[in-house]
């Protein structure tokens, strides 16, 4: 059967029919349906939503829709013993306490089971001591404190502002600095955009609003008790002491009203420079401790949260491929939310729902994709990407042999300015070509392509005339597919203007105020940006599942490998003397990149010229494309991060959200001048260069003619 026979209508017609079927009004309706009550992972409400989605996907026409469950470690506040922070006087009396909950938004006052703000997986504890303000608690912030300002955080409670990096990295850094507790807060400088009102009158964070979130450092492990294996009925579970990635000190988040009360009394050292000062009317002194009259007062944390093994549910829908049913294209996004999930995740889940509906309509008209499409509604993403990771662990053998691509579908919007895409270089050309065919939803770009508005508003920093596409990092459900399994992955959403809006994430992220009304009133009243994101995500899935030749371009990997090799070489050349002393050479890596470039171009020539009507040849060439991403996987993983196995990309060791290129070499070089044994440290650099060289060369060989 040829592809066109399998699909009954011409490919262009199919794609147009699929895109035309997507409707903004449906996305709006689905979003409203998904956001009326909280859907916290591990709760009955979220189980009911899983069953609802299962039922609707079946109605939409998928071949099968199953629930898969796992029993994973989750974390909840104690319902009768709330978490809070207090200022205590010298007699131990609490003279100030932080709020126990966020004031609920109008219309939601009677909603039950709104989980109060907490840091998921915080251990219990009641540390007390002096406060130290540590800015964003980034690696460089602690370097500034400890090395330049000679401030010791040992035995202190640190207070850090949210933003810039993943909160788990902040906690890890604080632990390493010897802190006994961490207070996280949202500074208006990062979460209150100038000229915009607070919710419910605008999209800014009110003073009582708080960002929830997990504070794990899982490094891709999934369920902390069953790393590497699915958390099923017969799984061996580690004890809590051996669990992966749990913080060892109490952590709690607060809003800026409460933060004001803690920070206004701060004494000790002044902040080192303006980059350490937020927008509150406080001095932003670093401490330690309170100033003058308040110097005898201390801060005390009261954390009583519990971690417990809890059942979670993924929904997995299948649309069987007509020609290559054993090749899987996956569209996945999570379903669990911290509270209502108006943006995160339901703006994404609503888009997935509409994409499923559109594919279902085509199927009902007799069409099938060439390859199998799997749709996933993941659970427990907010607790460490648990649902997706456990499912991938359970199905790893199938996925590594059959996985063509994974498209992520969390929040569809984090702003309404322009498109934002992170993906493997293999997908660059797919994304460019697709966005050239889609209409821009942006004001002032009527009748223009999405590619045009995206390029204008978010130009590539390196390549003029092209839009920016970023590296994949982590912090979302593509992690296991890309970083562990080496399945080509991508994500797309609408974003803010990063030039003018310096706030981190969107202001109401993970707060109770992330509601349907937030989206409908302030972000996307016409749901046109949601529709565009549906077209991009859906269009990518369609092309990946239906094109005869996979829409991957290995030449774009050659381009970025050259760029990344240049970048890491330039970093190492900040140490020219040591490079000489320890005979560190990048010649082999540059040679491997050149070989990759040459072989990729020859492969592309063969790809253009081969007989596409020969099914064996076609499958052979497609397999070379599919397995290229897999070829960048090192089975041994990165040092101390065995589940991050991609040699070209990994989440930054300093910020889980950000991607780092040649991470093994990068980490070996990081702060190398401070290493106690330089010979050993530069030996590790050389080892990492050799691993990278081998991997690039081996990947190149997979593109060579097979015989």
């Amino acid at each position: 059967k040829s592809s066109s026979e399998a699909t009954n209508i011409t490919p262009k017609h199919n794609m147009k029919a699929f895109l035309d079927e997507l409707k903004a009004e449906n996305i709006k309706k689905f979003l409203h349906n998904f956001t009326q009550i909280p859907h916290l992972a591990g709760t009955e409400q979220n189980f009911q939503l899983a069953k609802q989605i299962q039922s609707q996907w079946k109605e939409f026409g998928l071949d099968s829709v199953e629930l898969t469950h796992y029993d994973v470690l989750l974390s909840y506040p104690n319902k009768t013993h709330p978490n809070y922070i207090s200022i205590i006087n010298e007699d131990g009396n609490e003279i100030f306490n932080t709020s126990l909950f966020e004031p609920p938004p109008a219309g939601y006052e009677n909603v039950s089971d709104i989980v109060p703000p907490f840091s998921a997986f915080s251990p219990q504890g009641m540390p007390e001591g002096d406060l130290v303000y540590v800015n964003y608690a980034r690696t460089e912030d602690f370097f500034k404190l400890e090395r330049d300002m000679k401030i010791n955080c040992s035995g202190k409670i640190v207070i850090a502002r949210y933003g810039k990096v993943f909160r788990g990295n902040k906690v890890k850094n604080a632990q390493l600095a010897g802190a006994t507790g961490v207070i996280l807060y949202s500074d208006p400088d990062d979460y209150f955009a100038p000229g915009v009102k607070s919710y419910p009158d605008g999209w800014n964070l009110p003073g009582g609003g708080v960002q929830r979130g997990n504070i794990l450092n899982l490094n891709g492990a999934g369920d902390p008790l069953t790393p590497g294996y699915p958390a099923n009925e017969y799984a061996y579970r580690r004890g809590m002491a051996e669990a992966v990635g749990l913080p060892s000190i109490p952590v709690h988040p607060i809003g800026y009203y409460d933060a004001q009360k803690l920070l206004e009394k701060m004494g000790g050292s002044a902040s080192p420079d303006s980059s350490w000062r937020g927008s509150l009317k406080v001095p932003y002194n670093v401490g330690p401790g309170f100033t003058g009259n308040f110097s005898t007062q201390k801060v005390k944390m009261h954390i009583h949260s519990t971690s417990e093994v809890t059942r979670i549910y993924n929904v997995i829908g299948t649309l069987r491929g007509a020609v290559e049913p054993d090749r899987y294209v996956i569209l996945g996004g999570h379903r669990d939310s911290w509270v209502f999930g108006g943006i995160d995740p339901q703006s994404g889940a609503a888009v997935v729902h509409e994409i499923v509906r559109s594919f279902g309509m085509l199927k009902k008209e007799g069409w099938r994709p060439r390859r199998t499409i799997l749709f996933a509604s993941w659970d427990a993403e907010e607790f460490g990407l648990l649902g997706s990771t456990e499912w991938a662990e359970e199905n790893s053998r199938l996925l590594q042999e059959r996985g063509v691509a994974y498209i992520n579908a969390d929040s569809s919007i984090e702003g309404n300015y322009t498109l934002r895409v992170d993906c493997t270089p293999l997908m660059y050309s797919l994304v460019y070509n697709l966005t050239k065919e889609l209409e821009s939803p942006d004001e002032g770009f009527e009748g223009k392509s999405l590619y045009e508005s995206w390029t204008k508003k978010s130009p590539s920093p390196e390549f003029s005339g092209m839009p920016r596409i970023s590296k994949l990092g982590s912090g979302n459900d593509f992690e296991v597919f890309f970083q562990r399994l080496g399945i080509a992955s991508g994500r797309a959403r609408y974003t803010k203007n990063w030039e003018t809006n310096k706030f981190s994430s969107y202001p109401l992220y993970h707060s109770v105020y992330e509601t349907y009304e937030l989206v409908e009133k302030f972000y996307d009243p016409m749901f046109k940006y949601h529709l565009t994101v549906a077209q991009v995500r859906g269009g990518m899935v369609f092309e990946l599942a239906n094109s005869v030749v996979l829409p991957f371009d290995c030449r774009d990997y050659a381009v970025v490998l050259r760029k990344y090799a240049d970048k890491i070489y330039n970093i190492s050349m900040k140490h020219p003397q040591e490079m000489k002393t320890y005979s560190v050479s990048f010649d082999s890596l540059f040679s491997a990149v050149k070989n990759f470039t040459e072989i990729a171009s020859k492969f592309s020539e063969r790809l253009r010229d081969f007989d596409k009507s020969n099914p064996i040849l076609l499958r052979m060439m497609n397999d070379q494309l599919m397995f290229l991403e897999r070829a960048f996987i090192d089975p041994l993983g990165l040092p101390d991060r065995p589940f991050y196995r991609h040699v070209i990309y990994a989440p930054s060791s300093h910020n889980k959200y950000a991607g780092e290129s040649f991470p093994g070499i990068y980490d070996a070089l990081f702060d190398i001048e401070s290493k106690v044994d330089p010979s050993q440290a530069w030996g590790e650099v050389k080892r990492q260069i050799s691993i990278a060289t081998f991997t690039v060369q081996a990947a190149a060989e997979t593109l060579s003619e097979v015989a």
Epitope: Y428, S429, Y432, S460, E462, F463, S464, G465, M466, D553, C554, R555, D556, A558, V559, R562, K563, A565, D566, Y569, N570, M573, P576, F586, D587, F590, K594, T597, E598, A600, S601, K602, S604, E605, R608
Partner: antibody, heavy 121, light 111 residues
Framework: EVQLVESGGGLVQPGGSLRLSCAAS????????MSWVRQAPGKGLEWVSA????????YYADSVKGRFTISRDNSKNTLYLQMNSLRAEDSAVYYC??????????????WGQGTLVTVSS | QSVLTQPPSVSAAPGQKVTISCSGS????????VSWYQQLPGTAPKLLIY???KRPSGIPDRFSGSKSGTSATLGITGLQTGDEADYYC???????????FGGGTKLTVLG
Amino acid sequence: EVQLVESGGGLVQPGGSLRLSCAASGFTFSSYAMSWVRQAPGKGLEWVSAISGGSGSTYYADSVKGRFTISRDNSKNTLYLQMNSLRAEDSAVYYCAKDGVGATPYYFDYWGQGTLVTVSS
Amino acid sequence: QSVLTQPPSVSAAPGQKVTISCSGSSSNIGINYVSWYQQLPGTAPKLLIYDNNKRPSGIPDRFSGSKSGTSATLGITGLQTGDEADYYCGTWDSSLSAVVFGGGTKLTVLG
């Protein structure tokens, strides 16, 4: 046999624009990085810009950044250089060159015969 | 001012050997592959050496290339009058993300 044929050169006033083309044949055009290299009268070679194979990432010399735009049409096997805000110092013979390795610039194994651009009032 | 430094001119008699040097830095010649081009009067440049020391087909073995550290050298033995031309070295610069050339060396075959 590989052939590169440039066209579009000529006399233009300072501040003016010109678009150069390079018609390529004899190889899989889309797979190779392509560059423009110029040579002012009596002077040496100066690399101007390159565009990668694949999705067409672009690179520019500092002297032309923001004024020149390189592009390619793989369906027509043609390379372009859009030159805006031209200055007297842009006067040169402009050569189109093919990379000998693949998608990013390593060395130029084939060169066109060149097209003369004169910027003068 | 070129990123790579070449002598402006060299000369030798027919049959003799000549070398042309090309000096750069760790970010260009130090890590990347060097190529050499010959430009006969009034013609387009032609590739002479690539990957430091490889010759394209059709280039006689009288021409050779080498690289050491941050310098490269083009050698021509058995000089012929037809070798009179400008010679350019070129490479990629990993800091500039750009192709860089030497200023060119004019070879004169005496006699």
